[in-house]
């Protein structure tokens, strides 16, 4: 089986997580991703995803949350403004891909957030001014309200063959600003 | 602190093959995706290859993709670079990186590094 | 892959002096440009990320700036301890790739 470890990734309170999720760029580039949490004992919630298909460099904001798919770059962007101490969990990239089940994009990221500045000018401590660069233009996705009982399959890194490795179960459910609208038939 | 060794370096002919380790102290080895980073004498930096927290997720550099293995051993807080066929052009002072807390692609803390010479 | 291009490959300057860096990028690369600074015999250290963002306990001459395909490291007086080589780094897609490198030595 393959082994869920966890990317941890630690900031502050007011910083922006700005993570990258890697695919392969012919199969994955016009698919629908999404950024999911995972909490204990409960099947992995969809925050937010980008458009179907998925538009190259097109920014889509939920909340607090920023989607930006880079198909000529193979990869995801993912930014969490704002963060708040409550953010803290596990988190995820996926891409909707039916009827198959979603791959999982790179590993399970684990975020820490804790409380206050470090008092230096980190990496990261002015980029919560990230969100006002994003254009007016920025779309709100719908997210597919996908129900398969199946498994998560992990992408394969772009240099090795395509394998699909079950991981857990999944369930993608949707925030509650985000209009629930059944996308696969 | 954070604290990357390196080891495993020395000469070795055109063709043969090394074995490097890193090994890890003072953060969660596993929870970090890690790197290797060469430098050939008198030359600009070069990344070699990445592999991600689980070993799920591995990356390289054109010039050394299916001569070149990175693997890790969360376990032992190792990471390693089985290096075969090796060139004259491979020469060069090898880094264990990894990236800091918040980003990946960076690379922020180094290992002092290890000289790897392939000649004749 | 990204070639990034680094120049001049060497700067000559005197302590007090202003110096810029410039790195240009074969393709858009958004922000996603690191700047580091290594003296001989020594591992790289990591300076700036996100073009623009000064890691912690780097001192406040060294900037960065731009985005896209076009970057500046500007050190706004050169200190004794500056002279070394700086390279720039895009870790957008893979491969990450590095530019040249630009050697600060003493006029």
């Known amino acids: 089986a393959t082994k869920l470890t966890e990317e941890k990734y630690e900031l502050k309170e007011g910083q922006t997580l700005d993570v990258k999720c890697d695919y392969t760029l012919e199969k994955f580039a016009s698919s629908q991703k999404a950024w999911q949490i995972i909490r204990d004992g409960e099947m992995p919630k969809t925050l937010a995803c980008t458009e179907r298909p998925s538009k190259n460099s097109h920014p889509v904001q939920v909340g607090r949350i920023i989607l930006e798919d880079y198909h000529d770059h193979g990869l995801l962007r993912v930014r969490m403004v704002n963060l708040q101490v409550e953010d803290s969990g596990l988190y995820q990239c996926v891409i909707y891909q039916p009827p198959k089940e979603p791959h999982m994009l790179f590993d399970r990221i684990r975020l820490v957030v804790t409380k206050g500045f470090s008092g230096t000018p980190g990496s990261n401590e002015n980029s919560t001014q990230n969100v006002y660069k994003i254009p007016p233009t920025t779309t709100k996705a719908l997210c597919p309200l996908y129900t398969s009982p199946r498994t998560v399959t992990q992408a394969p890194p772009k240099s090795t063959a395509d394998v699909s490795t079950p991981d857990s179960e999944i369930n993608l459910t949707n925030v509650t600003d985000i209009i629930r609208v059944p996308v696969f038939n | 602190e954070v604290q990357l060794v390196e080891s495993g370096g020395g000469l070795v002919k055109p063709g043969g093959s090394l074995r490097l380790s890193c090994a890890a102290s003072g953060f969660t080895f596993s929870s970090y995706s890690m790197n290797w980073v060469r430098q050939a004498p008198g030359k600009g930096l070069e990344w070699v290859s990445s592999i991600s927290s689980s070993s799920n997720y591995i990356y390289y550099a054109d010039s050394v993709k299916g001569r070149f293995t990175i693997s890790r051993d969360n376990a032992k807080n190792s990471l390693y670079l089985q290096m075969n066929s090796l060139k004259a052009e491979d020469t060069a002072v090898y880094y264990c990186?990894?990236?800091?807390?918040?980003?990946?692609?960076?690379?922020?803390?180094w290992g002092q590094g290890t000289l790897v010479t392939v000649s004749s | 892959d990204i070639q990034m291009t680094q120049s001049p490959s060497t700067l000559s300057a005197s302590v007090g002096d202003r110096v810029t860096i410039t790195c240009r990028a074969s393709q858009s690369i958004n922000s996603w440009l690191a700047w580091y600074q290594q003296k001989p015999g020594k591992a790289p250290k990591l300076l700036i990320s996100d073009a623009s963002s000064l890691e912690s306990g780097v001192p406040s001459r060294f900037s960065g700036s731009g985005s896209g395909t076009e970057f500046t490291l500007t050190i706004s007086s050169l200190q004794p301890d500056d002279f070394a080589t700086y390279y720039c780094q895009q870790y957008g897609p893979y491969p990450y790739t590095f530019g040249g490198g630009t050697k600060v030595e003493i006029k």
């Open positions: 990186a990894r990236r800091p807390d918040d980003r990946r692609g960076l690379f922020q803390h």
